[in-house]
C-alpha cells in the first residue's frame, strides 16, 4: 500500500486509508502498512484538539511552573488556559 | 520501534542529590509523555509525575513534589529526574516509561542505592 | 488518590489451568463508556511489560491467553491457559486522574 493506507488482509488484496483520532483522542499506535492507526481517549490531564492519524493527546499546560493559575480548566478537548494571579491589593 | 535507555546504578550518601537520565530513541521524543516511576523492594509501584518534551510543562504526584525534579533536553532527546536530599527511603529502581494512559514502553531501570 | 487493592496477593496455578487476578478500585475509574484501568507483567529483574490498556484491550505482542475485563471499581485480568512462561508479578494500574497509582501486585506461581 502507499504511504497513508494500510492493507485490509493479509493477502493485502485492498487497500484503505488510515483512521484519524477526533478531537479528545490521540493517536497510541501509529499505523503501519498493515495494520490501522489505533486511538485512545484523552484521560483527565490529558488533551486532543485535532484530528489526526499521528498526534497523541498532550498533559494539559502546568500552569503553577510558569508561576500563573488556571483561569479556565482543560478538557479532553482543551487545554487549560493560564492567567495572572491575583494580587491582593493594599 | 520505541527504545528508552536509563543511565547506570549509582550508589550515594544520605543527603546528596542525584541525576537519572533516560535517552529516547526511535521516535519523535517532543511528542511524547514521559512518566517517572519508582519501585522499591522490587515490589511496590509509584508514579512520580511526568513531563512533556515540547514545552517542558510537567505534573508531579503531590508525594514527589520536594523529592524530584523533571527535566528534559529536546536536542538530545533525553529526560531527566533529580532526586534531592537523598535518605535511604529513596533508594529503589527508578523507571521512566512513556506513555498517557497506561505506559506503553519503559526503560530498563536505574538502581538508586543510599547508604552512609 | 485512587487506592487500588489486588487479591491475592499470590496464587499457585497448575500448568494449562486458569490463573484470576481481581484488582479493586477505592472509586470508579470508568467514565464516558471508557474504564481507564491496565495491567502489567513483571518478571524479576525486568521492566514491567504491558498487557492490557483501558480494561480488556490487548496490548501488540501479547498472547490471546491473556484478557481483562472490569468496569467501574471492579477488574479482572484472567490468564487461560497458563503457561510457565506467565510466572511472573501482575500489577493494575489506572489513567482515571492524577496522580496515576498502581496496585500492590499479585505473584503467579506455575505447577
Known amino acids: 500500500c502507499e504511504e497513508g493506507w494500510h492493507c485490509t488482509s493479509e493477502a493485502c488484496e485492498s487497500c484503505v486509508l488510515h483512521r484519524s483520532c477526533s478531537p479528545g483522542f490521540g493517536v497510541k499506535q501509529i499505523a503501519t502498512g498493515v495494520s490501522d492507526t489505533i486511538c485512545e481517549p484523552c484521560p483527565v490531564g490529558f488533551f486532543s484538539n485535532v484530528s489526526s492519524a499521528f498526534e497523541k493527546c498532550h498533559p494539559w499546560t502546568s500552569c503553577e511552573t510558569k508561576d500563573l493559575v488556571v483561569q479556565q480548566a482543560g478538557t479532553n478537548k482543551t487545554d487549560v488556559v493560564c492567567g495572572p494571579q491575583d494580587r491582593l491589593r493594599a | 520501534e520505541v527504545q528508552l535507555q536509563q543511565s547506570g546504578p549509582e550508589l550515594v550518601k544520605p543527603g546528596a542529590s542525584m541525576k537519572i537520565s533516560c535517552k529516547a530513541s526511535?521516535?519523535?521524543?517532543?511528542?511524547?509523555?514521559m512518566n517517572w516511576v519508582k519501585q522499591s523492594h522490587g515490589k511496590k509501584l509509584e508514579w512520580i509525575g511526568l513531563?512533556?518534551?515540547?514545552?517542558?510543562?510537567?505534573s508531579y504526584n503531590q508525594k514527589f513534589k520536594d523529592k524530584a525534579t523533571l527535566t528534559v533536553d529536546k536536542s538530545s532527546s533525553t529526560a531527566y529526574m533529580e532526586l534531592l536530599s537523598l535518605t535511604t527511603e529513596d533508594s529503589a529502581v527508578y523507571y521512566c516509561?512513556?506513555?498517557?494512559?497506561?505506559?506503553?514502553?519503559w526503560g530498563q531501570g536505574t538502581t538508586l542505592t543510599v547508604s552512609g | 488518590d485512587i487506592v487500588l487493592t489486588q487479591s491475592p496477593t499470590s496464587l499457585a496455578v497448575f500448568l494449562g489451568q486458569r490463573a484470576t487476578i481481581s484488582c479493586r478500585a477505592s472509586?470508579?475509574?470508568?467514565?464516558?463508556?471508557?474504564?481507564?484501568m491496565h495491567w502489567y507483567q513483571q518478571k524479576p529483574g525486568q521492566s514491567p511489560k504491558p498487557l492490557i490498556y483501558?480494561?480488556?484491550n490487548l496490548e501488540s505482542g501479547v498472547p490471546a491467553r491473556f484478557s481483562g475485563s472490569g468496569s467501574g471499581t471492579d477488574f479482572t485480568l484472567n490468564i487461560h491457559p497458563v503457561e510457565e512462561e506467565d510466572a511472573a508479578t501482575y500489577y493494575c494500574?489506572?489513567?482515571?486522574?492524577?496522580?496515576?497509582?498502581f496496585g500492590g501486585g499479585t505473584k503467579l506461581e506455575i505447577k
Open positions: 513531563i512533556n518534551p515540547y514545552n517542558g510543562g510537567t
Open positions: 494500574q489506572h489513567s482515571r486522574e492524577l496522580p496515576r497509582t
Open positions: 472509586k470508579s475509574v470508568s467514565t464516558s463508556g471508557y474504564s481507564y
Open positions: 526511535g521516535y519523535s521524543f517532543a511528542d511524547y509523555t
Open positions: 483501558l480494561a480488556s
Open positions: 516509561a512513556e506513555g498517557v494512559n497506561n505506559f506503553a514502553d
